[in-house]
Interface confidence: low
Amino acid sequence: MNGRVDYLVTEEEINLTRGPSGLGFNIVGGTDQQYVSNDSGIYVSRIKENGAAALDGRLQEGDKILSVNGQDLKNLLHQDAVDLFRNAGYAVSLRVQHRLQVQNGPIGHRGEGDPSGIPIFMVLVPVFALTMVAAWAFMRYRQQL
């Protein structure tokens, strides 16, 4: 089992009504300008103050936009994605992925023990070394007999 539980991905549908200054956010990404390595997805780079997205409050910088009005944003050039948002109409439905990080979270630990948690190898290595030393001493002692 992977011992890390340090981030959480949520997806939700966000319905925005276009305001005087548009949807109120900027995007980065696309097949021609990857924002995340090995990911050509479209990400929110900036939420404009008092814009439609900011007033709604759910969309956040760093969110990945998966679809606009049901249209998938996979494998789009950046400008094509921009055009899609511009032509999306007055009421816009966004499928958005939020990634929440545990801030400076350590490697997970088991149960209700000490929150610092002791990595298993820190226990196993000394035990193994002690076992080897004991075995060596025993063999040598036997030979002397």
């Epitope: 959480l8 991905v9 630990h109």
Partner: nanobody, 120 residues
């Protein structure tokens, strides 16, 4: 459809304690990762803590030593014991569930409606 229902929020004085509960319907609770995250008005969402089916836990630095996550697989319930509460802990707390031990992928209907915690 999986449903998550949080309870236990409320108004508490700084230094006080609260215990949040998250009841999950559905039969896949046993193999799920469960987590709590929170959002205060005008602030970014923050993942507070998560726990795997095997009991491995993780905490944000801001709550470490004060909050304890636990789960009762038999009862399909997860808990968040919050001690030494501070005004900055004020937020809506959501529970969420997923099916991976490395992260939680949560569809919108796999997240609760939240419970308000206010620390004065």
């Amino acid at each position: 459809e999986v449903q998550l229902v949080e309870s236990g929020g409320g108004l508490v004085q700084a230094g006080g304690s609260l215990r949040l509960s998250c009841a999950a319907s559905g039969s896949i609770f046993r193999i799920d990762v469960m987590g709590w995250y929170r959002q205060a008005p005008g602030k970014q969402r923050e993942l507070v803590t998560a726990i795997t089916s095997g009991g491995i836990t993780n905490y944000a630095d801001s709550v470490k030593g004060r909050f304890t996550i636990s789960r009762d697989n038999a009862e399909n319930t997860m808990y968040l014991q919050m001690n030494s509460l501070k005004p900055e802990d004020t937020a809506v707390y959501y529970c969420a569930k997923g099916i991976s031990d490395s992260y939680l992928r949560v569809e919108s209907n796999y997240r609760g409606q939240g419970t308000q915690v206010t620390v004065s």
